[in-house]
């Protein structure tokens, strides 16, 4: 067991003339917070898998108000470390996602609004007990500097936190076959950590995590006596050399426990010990709750306020998967005609048409547009004998040469707030609404679809929406 620790050093605009404006203003003060999600790095888990190694949410940072006319500085950060405890061995290679969130503290009715500012990800090799590792990453116009480490919780030591150390029983030396624990030379390496639950009386191990049985005992944890009463035992036929000690097919054969659960035999059947995040007779049900923040890309988490009710992520347009982690490849349906290029902007599909074609799906043949140039990916469209440029997101003007404010068209419904974002725009919805453009009421039929908040978590807290 141990703890992964993340220290955020700075979050601010990257260098260069294209630096972003501050995310806060005098009218809308705000503060930052961070979320980290960890997964084992070399497992072939799907991108949508939950944060199998754990996740953590930081405290809120100090309130920040932009000084008019001043460039955006590094923004004030929350105090302290983000800590993700891990129960089992540290995997050595891990994947991380770090998200930077903004909490607005303006006069929103019903409490603050949240929006995602930046997200960085990576896969790294890291030994537990080693020094802090540093990283610098860019996400859009922002730059994040951070350090991380994994440390073992006593008495565990070693690069994977699988060895145990105990104070010496004798002042001069360790017991038979046990070495001093570097760097704690005054402590001794304890016997190997066997598989969790391995019988101390009837089992032993030569490698961490295994459980080998003494003669007369069987089962994954060496807790089941081998039957010697009758060679007609339901556990299998006798053996000429070992009498009745050869076990036949047992209830744990083939491991009926799903999702990495470990099986132990009981007198009547078997029992599954499930890893964190799963439950059920065979560990077949995900026990992740909304409090774990399992929904990505602005997905809304519903249900699962306690481990006995599974959660569901309601995904915004453009995303799918059990955790809203997969971008829907709507371009695979080839919606753009006449050789148009399909762009999936997440909130909408856009067809970038070849010269001479226009319309939402490039369905209009416009010969008179052939000689007209629309800059920055704009498309020439005909209207009543004239032609004009339909500009790509972020551009405007007659020829799409002017930078446009993507929020100018007030795209966020139901009082949602619009923010220009490095990949387009982001809507921070008023309480009671969801979706990329705040177009969906959370409780259309009058009954709230949001579950009761878990202890210590207000309804609508961002942990529910990650």
């Amino acid at each position: 067991a141990g703890v992964f620790e993340l220290q955020i050093h700075s979050f601010g605009p990257g260098p260069g003339p294209g630096a972003p404006r501050s995310p806060c203003s005098a009218r809308l003060p705000c503060r930052l917070f961070f979320r980290v999600c960890l997964k084992p790095g070399l497992s072939e888990e799907a991108a949508e898998s939950p944060c199998a190694l754990g996740a953590a949410l930081s405290a809120r940072g100090p309130v920040y108000t932009e000084q008019p006319g001043a460039p955006a500085p590094d923004l004030p950060l929350p105090d302290g470390l983000l800590q993700v405890p891990f129960r089992d061995a540290w995997p050595g290679t891990f994947s991380f996602i770090i998200e930077t969130w903004r909490e607005e503290l303006g006069d929103q009715i019903g409490g603050p609004a949240w929006s995602l500012l930046a997200r960085v990800a990576g896969r790294r090799r890291l030994a537990a007990g080693g020094p802090w590792a540093r990283d610098i990453q860019r996400a859009g116009a922002w730059e994040l500097r951070f350090s991380y480490r994994a440390r073992c919780e006593p008495p565990a030591v070693g690069t994977a936190c699988t060895r145990l150390c105990r104070p010496r029983s004798a002042p001069s030396r360790c017991g038979p076959g046990l070495r001093p624990c570097a760097p704690l030379e005054d402590e001794c390496e304890a016997p190997l950590v066997c598989r969790a639950g391995c019988s101390p009386e009837h089992g032993f191990c030569e490698q961490p995590g295994e459980c080998r049985c003494l003669e007369g005992w069987t089962g994954p944890l060496c807790t089941v006596p081998v039957s010697t009463s009758s060679c007609l035992s339901p556990r299998g036929p006798s053996s000429a050399t070992t009498g009745c000690l050869v076990p036949g097919p047992g209830p744990c054969d083939g491991n009926p426990c799903a999702n990495g659960g470990s099986c132990s035999e009981t007198p009547r059947s078997f029992e599954c010990t499930c890893p964190r995040g799963f439950y059920g007779l065979r560990c077949e049900v995900s026990g992740v709750t909304c409090a774990d923040g399992p929904c990505f890309n602005g997905g809304l988490c519903v249900g699962g306020a306690d481990p006995d009710s599974a959660y569901i992520c309601h995904c915004p347009p453009g995303f799918q998967g059990s955790n809203c982690e997969k971008r829907v490849d709507r371009c695979s349906l080839q919606p753009c005609r006449n050789g148009g290029l399909c762009l999936d902007l997440g909130h909408a599909l856009r067809c970038r048409c070849r010269a001479g074609f226009a319309g939402p799906r490039c369905e209009h043949d416009l010969d008179d547009c052939a000689g007209r140039a629309c800059a920055n990916g704009g498309t020439c469209v005909e209207g009543g004998g004239a032609h004009r440029c339909s500009c790509a997101l972020g551009f405007g003007g007659r020829d799409c040469r002017e930078r446009a404010d993507p929020c100018a068209a007030r795209p966020c419904a139901h009082g949602g707030r619009c923010y220009a974002h490095f990949s387009g725009l982001v809507c921070a919805c008023a309480p009671g609404y969801m979706g990329a453009r705040c177009e969906f009421p959370v409780h259309p039929d009058g009954a709230s679809a949001l579950p009761a908040a878990p202890p210590g978590l207000r309804p609508g807290d961002p942990q529910r929406y990650l």
């Epitope: 997200r119 990800a121 990576g122 540093r134 990453q137 860019r138």
Partner: antibody
């Protein structure tokens, strides 16, 4: 304006070592990492490793781990990359680049290293 | 190490054409992909980072898209100075790796 200026071309014999320098200017030297990338004639790009000038921490591509050394001199804002036990396949243009882990935004002009007997 | 496969390896086009280059990663790299332009005898120049962010000073005719394993670099209207070799680079895992390059030539 960020600038990285590298040392001149080198011709070396197999088994020898080469030390290439990269002098940085136009920014706070310790604020960003310096990466080294090489490109054999007519080939693609291969990352060799980086040095964090603040901590002198280095990380290398396993392909070069036992042969490459990276050092820095903060007084002159210069980073050095030394490659030992040279072989003919080390003939390449060696570039230094300024950045973090997911961006190399400014590059040196390159140093040609020829390994020939 | 993560492998990046670029296609096509070479491409002939004319000034004013719209050009698309693709890069496929051997596994999910989220949005950790950058695009570089290299002209003969010169160092590579960063165009796009984190899949779709345009580096300062790069003309807006360059754009990047994609996430996960499939990425695209698009030049909306080729200019004479755009004829060069283009490389993609993943920065999700260590070591960072580059695609084999796409040589863009004048038709």
């Amino acid at each position: 304006q960020v600038q990285l200026v590298q040392s001149g071309a080198e011709v070396k014999k197999p088994g020898a070592s080469v030390k290439v320098s990269c002098k940085a200017s136009g920014y706070t030297f310790t604020r960003y990492w310096i990466h080294w990338i090489r490109q054999a004639p007519g080939q693609g790009l291969e990352w060799m490793g980086y040095i964090n000038p603040t901590t002198v921490y280095t990380e290398f591509n396993q392909n070069f781990k036992d042969r490459v050394t990276m050092t820095r001199d903060t007084s002159t804002s210069t980073v050095y990359m030394e490659l030992s036990s040279l072989r003919s396949e080390d003939t390449a243009v060696y570039y230094c680049a300024h950045g973090g882990s997911n961006f190399f935004d400014y590059w040196g002009q390159g140093t040609t290293v020829t390994v020939s007997s | 190490a993560i492998q990046l496969t670029q296609s096509p390896s070479s491409l002939s086009a004319s000034v004013g054409d719209r050009v698309t280059i693709t890069c496929r990663a051997s596994e999910n790299i989220y949005y950790n992909l950058a695009w570089y332009q290299q002209k003969p005898g010169k160092a590579p120049k960063l165009l796009i980072y984190t899949a779709n962010s345009l580096e300062d000073g790069v003309p807006s005719r360059f754009s990047g898209s994609g996430s996960g394993t499939d990425f695209t670099l698009t030049i909306s209207s080729l200019q004479p100075e755009d004829f060069a070799t283009y490389f993609c680079k993943q920065a999700y895992d260590v070591p960072p790796t580059f695609g084999g390059g796409t040589k863009l030539e004048i038709k």
